[in-house]
């Protein structure tokens, strides 16, 4: 992908609210461009924190001010609403509410929007078109919650505008403003090490790949030109500097490690794969 992010691209905001008891609560709000966090919410000052220099996209200061006020008011209102209806909805303290909402982009065009609310980690209600609908598995509590949420159609209209207009406008502006950052190519570094011994007479070989951007990467243990199907790829993990880290492991009999190599393919390498040979690997570490 030209922007260094995998299709479909999305922008979404997550709200995680923890209700410990009737009066003690806490919330975390964050904004994400696919898997890159671009915004957070400072609860103390009730302000949006822009985590990247380009996180404002092409929105004016005035629109940001209005959105900030909307989030501030809705956070207060949501907390109060959930607290008020907790008993009626049979929400038992302590409980957690997770909300995620945003929009998706496919081939440069908006392909849809979403807004979902979960109770205790399970799907509860979602926003479709212009109203809240319960997930069938969530039962009568969710139906009642939707009845409450759908009392104010004007608020639902604002929510609809946020999803169908604001979010698509924002994601396009964000991609444009962050183009240089998102299209950058950062070469990976790779090194080999021993993993914990899998058993007598066996070795675990570890190939570490770090500092690469964008995220898509191919890492494989090889014997000559033969891919080793036993290669176990870990999760691609984020680094603090916005690059990625991955490790690939392979378990082999001690005498079969000599002619193995780790091959790394990444867009930044422009076809010049990194190949590290286990036999050249220092046994220290």
């Amino acid at each position: 992908n030209a922007d260094g992010l995998k299709e479909p691209l999305s922008f979404h905001v997550t709200w995680i609210a923890s209700f410990y008891n009737h009066s003690w609560k806490q919330n975390l709000v964050s904004g994400w461009l696919s898997d890159l966090q671009t915004h957070t919410w400072d609860s103390n000052s009730s302000t949006i924190v822009f985590l990247c220099p380009w996180s404002r996209g092409n929105f004016s200061n005035e629109e940001w001010k209005e959105l900030e006020t909307l989030f501030r008011i809705r956070t207060i209102r949501s907390f109060e609403g959930i607290r008020r209806y907790a008993h009626e909805l049979q929400f038992e303290y302590p409980f957690e509410i997770q909300v995620t909402g945003g929009c998706e982009l496919h081939s440069g065009k908006v392909s849809g929007s979403f807004l979902q609310l979960a109770y205790q980690g399970s799907d509860f209600v979602s926003f479709q078109n212009n109203s809240w609908l319960p997930y069938p598995v969530a039962g009568n509590m969710a139906k009642h919650f939707c009845k409450v949420l759908n009392q104010n159609q004007h608020e639902n209209d604002i929510t609809h505008n946020l999803l169908s207009d604001t979010c698509p406008r924002f994601i396009l502006g964000l991609l444009d403003a962050g183009k240089a950052h998102l299209q950058r190519q950062v070469k990976p570094e790779a090194w080999l090490s021993h993993g914990p011994s899998p058993g007598p007479g066996h070795l675990q070989l570890v190939c570490h790949v770090s500092g690469f951007y964008p995220k898509p990467v191919w890492v494989m243990w090889m014997r000559g030109e033969q891919e080793q199907q036993g290669t176990q790829r870990g999760d691609i993990l984020p680094s603090a500097d916005g690059t990625w880290y991955l490790r690939a492991t392979l378990e082999v009999a001690a005498g079969e490690a000599a002619d193995l190599s780790c091959r790394v393919k990444h867009s930044s390498l422009e076809g010049q794969d990194i190949v590290l040979y286990w036999e050249h690997h220092s046994s220290v570490g």
Partner: antibody, heavy 115, light 110 residues
Framework: SVEESGGRLVTPGTPLTLTCTVS????????MSWVRQAPGKGLEWIGI?????TTYYASWAKGRFTISKTSTTVDLKITSPTTEDTATYFC?????????????WGPGTLVTVSS | AVEMTQTPASMSAAVGGTVTIKCQAS??????LAWYQQKPGQPPKLLIY???TLASGVPSRFKGSGSGTEYTLTISGVQCDDAATYYC????????????FGGGTEMVVE
């Protein structure tokens, strides 16, 4: 912009429809409110029509007023005016992300109810 | 419906001085409050929304604060042009509460 029209002298009980004509924005994206102000008195909120067309009224205004809209106009019908309905009627665009406040108001249209 | 009580009903202010207008809601409106300024023969002008956010083009001399049921509009460095009637408006829950206005505060500048 926002502009009200239709204000005039009417006799009590004669229905009257005020029209708010908008330009430069879409009524499918913005809610609109009606507010009135009797001579020398304060502002009184009558009701709102949401961008999707749902209407809400002040408790005192229910049954006395009806708000409706087309693609470029918002109407306020005073069903059976009384002398207490003599006022300047304002139409206001509710801000895009707003639960009710409005930054764009029309100049108002004067309705006088007298026999 | 929520009732909005505004105080004082009228006041006079000295040029350069600071004035405070209060608005009390009959129940918690969770910062869903706006302030307007209205001059004779004109429609109201939005000053503050969300209890404390300054509307576009409004001088920073105007400041909104408060939470729960108590809200305040403070005008510092009062100017002759500030002579007007000021209104608060509840914008909490349109469906249940309506967008009720306070009774207004008429401010004369001397």
């Amino acid at each position: 912009s926002v502009e009200e029209s239709g204000g005039r002298l009417v006799t009590p009980g004669t229905p009257l429809t005020l029209t708010c004509t908008v330009s430069g924005f879409s009524l499918s994206s913005y809610a609109m409110s009606w507010v009135r102000q009797a001579p020398g008195k304060g502002l009184e909120w009558i009701g709102i029509i949401s961008s999707s067309g749902t209407t809400y009224y002040a408790s005192w205004a229910k049954g006395r007023f009806t708000i409706s809209k087309t693609s470029t106009t918002v109407d306020l019908k005073i069903t059976s005016p009384t002398t207490e309905d003599t006022a300047t009627y304002f139409c206001a665009r509710v801000d895009y992300y707003s639960s009710g406040w409005g930054g764009l108001w029309g100049p108002g249209t004067l309705v006088t109810v007298s026999s | 419906a929520v009732e909005m009580t505004q105080t004082p009903a009228s006041m006079s202010a000295a040029v350069g001085g600071t004035v405070t207008i209060k608005c009390q809601a009959s129940e918690d409106i969770y910062s869903n409050l706006a302030w307007y300024q209205q001059k004779p023969g004109q429609p109201p002008k939005l000053l503050i929304y969300g209890a404390s956010t300054l509307a576009s083009g409004v001088p920073s001399r105007f400041k909104g604060s408060g939470s729960g049921t108590e809200y305040t509009l403070t005008i510092s460095g009062v100017q002759c042009d500030d002579a007007a009637t000021y209104y608060c408006q509840c914008t909490y829950d349109t469906s249940s509460y309506g967008n009720t206005f306070g009774g207004g505060t008429e401010m004369v500048v001397e």
